[in-house]
Interface confidence: low
């Protein structure tokens, strides 16, 4: 049988019934159970530095009678490599350095074999090799670097991160992987728990605004962070959260704007900004004004990017009636965190000093244009209406009025310069043109460079000062054989003069030439008139031409009446009525002209 | 020259009115403000009013209104206070003054004086 | 009204001393604040404007200081004509307010 001389023999059994025996660094006796072995197993530690061989142990047979007839072979996990065998004297030795971190176990097989015939002398053995453990690995952290947020002002104890480091070493077996955690770097402000690696806070009022960014160094260390135990660290980064610890300020007690009265509602005039340490919603700062003597005649508006508060015009001002307005602005956080109340109000207030500018307005007519009316037989000098300015500013500054003469460049109309009378200067005419446009000028005396501009439209009303005339020059001529009450002619007449009521015109024989006419004027009432024959026959040889004057009439007031003349020739006509000689014979007989008889 | 010439001491009986004049010279009269401070043995100095002679604006310690009327004319670089209902109180010596100009920002400040108008009340 | 409390209300100093005459606002003036000189019988005359400025020909041995609701008027170099009564005066709003006056005289 193999065995181990070193081993104790369990009595009671005779050798020749044990296999294989083993000697070495075996921890405790094999024991045997009916035919089969146990094998306890080999311990050998790990990182062995020596430089010889490390010693495992010695196979021995029974059979073995040391005269080198027997060879003992290795096999199974690392066998030739790792672990090399004395094939005579049966020593086992590990050959490198062992780590229980790669692998804790080797599993061997060992046989006794008969050099001669190459048969094993024994049943194959199996036993193990147990790489005993020791400290040769530090703690490793999950994280090279961990971040953690936490609010400011927390209370101690807070949670604010746990930390996790791990050791390769054998839990199982002395305190090679008990980790112990411990702060490095972070008091007074952090601490950790040291079993747990939970980080907390340490201190009360951890002010943001003082500090945000800790660096907090944590170590892990093995054998229950005993003497001799390996570590490793980590880094911790945390950030401090801000909460709304901090009210508003305005950085100075009194701000001064000033604004011309002419802003208008709306006008940013100005703008404030408190300061406020917190950050985000904390330092969303809303602005009101509070009191004061400008309290509704200006507005404050919170920009929302800038966190400015922009003071804007409310009403409109008036230099002339307050020049100085005094306000009180309040800046405060809409975002108040209750449990900070007791560092007072989270508001702050500024005197805002408001200064009016003076702006010279100039004069404002009364109407955004003026339309008057004069007749056109109005004499020089009549009054045609009148224009008003005044002085926007409280003082009412006296105005002059005077007309552009750009747009009366002959000079038909002026204006009294202190009252706005306007009047004419020239005589009008109506017929020529119907309609004035011109511009007056309203000045303030004290101040020319203030002026307005007001257009007047001035219609010249009509009068009947235009007698109606032809409507074109009549040169008519009649048959020699006309009859009596032949219509000969058609006047129509036309007036420069526009009466309300529409033209109404009269047509008749000018009294000098009614009596005794060789013609008739036939008035037919619609503004035309016919000339008629008034015999039978006309003699050309006897009278060529005659000369009708014919007076036309309106029916306005006062009438207008004119005369206009009507040539009438003597013609020799076909039967159809058709002329075929019409000579002035009045040029051989000069007397042969007149006008009717 | 900057100049505030004030017309001369009145003597008034309770219950009357009294019309003062300032005329000013050596500068632009209708650029700067005009103030009145009256001048008491009990009260030390004390501000009246403005008045702007450009645009004729007023404005009146709420004390003196109803009491004291500003009013101007430009054409004579003049400015008045008429002053009403007159009592024993009243009795002060009375001052125009000329306010610094807009540029300083500084309106109430007074830089030049007229030499005062005594206004004594008595039955 | 703001009131103005001058202090004190009259002093007796030497030729060549420095004096100093206090004037304190019932509320923040934010400097709107003048100095005035009335000598026997004459009109007031300003001295300082916006609480440090110098008027015009004032000599520069008179000083004006301060903020806020506290001011003061510095005299160096005491001189004889220097004998008045001195008021200061806010201009923060209407109406604009005096004191009462200090009365300065030479030992």
């Known amino acids: 049988t193999l065995s181990t001389p070193l081993s104790k023999r369990t009595s009671g059994f005779p050798a020749k019934k044990r296999a294989l025996e083993l000697s070495g660094n075996s921890k405790n006796e094999l024991s045997r159970s009916k035919r089969s072995w146990m094998w306890n197993q080999f311990f050998l530690l790990e990182e062995y530095t020596g430089s010889d061989y490390q010693y495992v142990g010695k196979l021995h047979s029974d059979q073995d009678r040391g005269d080198g007839s027997l060879k003992y072979i290795l096999s199974g996990d690392g066998a030739g490599d790792l672990f090399i065998i004395n094939e005579n004297t049966g020593d086992i030795q590990a050959t490198k350095r062992l780590d229980r971190e790669e692998k804790p176990v080797y599993i061997l097989r060992a046989q006794a074999i008969n050099r001669r015939t190459g048969r094993p002398v024994e049943p194959e053995s199996e036993f193990i090799i147990k790489i005993h453990d020791i400290n040769d690995n530090e703690p490793i952290f999950t994280k090279e670097v961990y971040t953690a947020t936490v609010p400011e002002m927390s209370d101690v104890g807070t949670f604010v991160v746990q930390v996790t480091a791990t050791d390769a070493d054998d839990p199982t077996y002395g305190n090679s992987a008990k980790v112990v955690y411990s702060i490095l770097q972070g008091q007074p402000y952090f601490s950790v728990e040291s079993e747990t690696g939970i980080i907390k806070t340490a201190l009360l009022n951890m002010d943001r605004e003082n500090r945000e960014q800790y660096q907090v160094v944590i170590q892990a260390k093995d054998m229950g962070g005993q003497m001799g135990g390996l570590s490793g660290t980590t880094t911790v980064n945390i950030t401090l959260t801000d909460v709304n610890d901090n009210p508003p300020r305005f950085p100075q007690s009194t701000y001064q704007f000033k604004t011309p009265e002419s802003s208008p509602p709306g006008t940013p005039i100005g703008r404030i900004k408190a300061s406020d340490a917190d950050v985000g919603e904390n330092a969303e700062i809303e602005y009101s004004i509070t009191d004061g003597e400008g309290l509704d005649m200006f507005d404050v508006i919170t920009d929302q990017e800038t966190q400015e508060g922009i003071i804007t015009v409310k009403k409109l001002l008036d230099f002339e009636k307050k020049k100085v307005y005094t306000l009180k602005v309040e800046a405060s956080n809409p975002h108040v965190e209750p449990r900070f109340l007791y560092l007072g109000p989270f508001k702050d207030s500024a005197t805002v000093r408001i200064v009016v500018e003076d702006v010279d307005e100039p004069p404002v007519f009364s109407k955004l244009a003026y339309i008057l009316q004069i007749r056109e037989d109005a004499q020089i000098n009549t009054t045609i209406g009148s224009v008003t300015a005044q002085d926007p500013d409280a003082a009412r500054n006296p105005v002059k009025y005077s007309v552009d003469r750009h747009t009366d460049m002959d000079r038909i109309f002026n204006i009294d310069s202190g009252n706005g009378s306007i009047f004419t200067s020239k005589l009008l005419d109506r017929e020529t043109l119907l309609w004035h446009n011109i511009t007056v000028i309203a000045t303030e005396i004290n101040n020319p460079k203030q002026s307005s501009r007001v257009p007047l439209y001035i219609k010249v009303l009509d009068v009947n000062d235009n007698a109606p005339e032809f409507a074109e020059f009549y040169e008519t001529f009649v048959c020699e054989k006309a009859k009596a009450d032949q219509l000969i002619q058609t006047l129509r007449a036309v007036d420069k003069d526009d009466p309300y009521s529409g033209h109404q015109f009269s047509f008749s024989l000018a009294p000098e030439a009614a009596s005794g006419s060789n013609f008739t004027i036939q008035d037919n009432k619609d503004n035309t008139a016919g000339i008629l024959t008034r015999k039978n026959g006309y003699n050309r040889h006897e009278m060529s031409t005659y000369l009708l004057p014919v007076v036309i009439s309106d029916n306005d007031y006062p009438v207008q009446s004119s005369t206009g003349t009507v040539t009438v020739r003597v013609c020799a006509c076909d039967h159809h009525g058709n002329m075929q000689s019409c000579h002035a014979e009045a040029l051989i007989h000069p007397t042969g002209l007149s006008t009717g008889a | 020259e900057v100049q505030l010439q004030q017309s001369g001491p009145e003597l008034v009986k309770p219950g009357d009115s009294v019309k003062m004049s300032c005329k000013a010279s050596g500068y632009t009269f209708t650029d700067y403000y005009m103030a009145w401070v009256r001048q008491s043995h009990r009260k030390s100095l004390e501000w009246i009013g403005y008045i702007f002679p450009n645009s004729g604006g007023t404005d009146y310690s709420q004390k003196f209104k109803g009491k004291a009327t500003l009013t101007v004319d430009k054409s004579s670089s003049t400015v008045y206070m008429e002053l009403h209902s007159l009592t024993s109180e009243d009795s002060a010596v009375y001052y125009c003054?000329?306010?610094?100009?807009?540029?300083?920002?500084?309106?109430?400040?007074?830089?030049?004086w007229g030499q005062g108008t005594s206004v004594s009340v008595s039955s | 009204d703001i009131q103005m409390t001058q202090s004190p209300a009259s002093l007796s100093a030497s030729v060549g001393e420095t004096v100093t005459i206090t004037c304190r606002a019932s509320?923040?003036?934010?400097?709107?604040l003048a100095w005035y000189q009335q000598k026997q019988g004459k009109s007031p005359q300003l001295l300082v404007y916006s609480a440090t400025l110098l008027a015009d020909g004032v000599p520069s041995r008179f000083s004006g200081s301060g903020s806020g609701t506290q001011y003061s008027l510095k005299i160096n170099s005491l001189k004889s004509e220097d004998v008045a009564r001195y008021y200061c005066?806010?201009?923060?709003?209407?109406?604009?307010?005096f004191g009462s006056g200090t009365k300065l005289e030479i030992k």
């Open positions: 003054a000329r306010e610094l100009g807009a540029d300083y920002g500084d309106y109430y400040a007074m830089d030049h």
């Open positions: 005066q806010h201009y923060y709003r209407t109406p604009p307010t």
């Open positions: 509320e923040n003036i934010d400097s709107y």
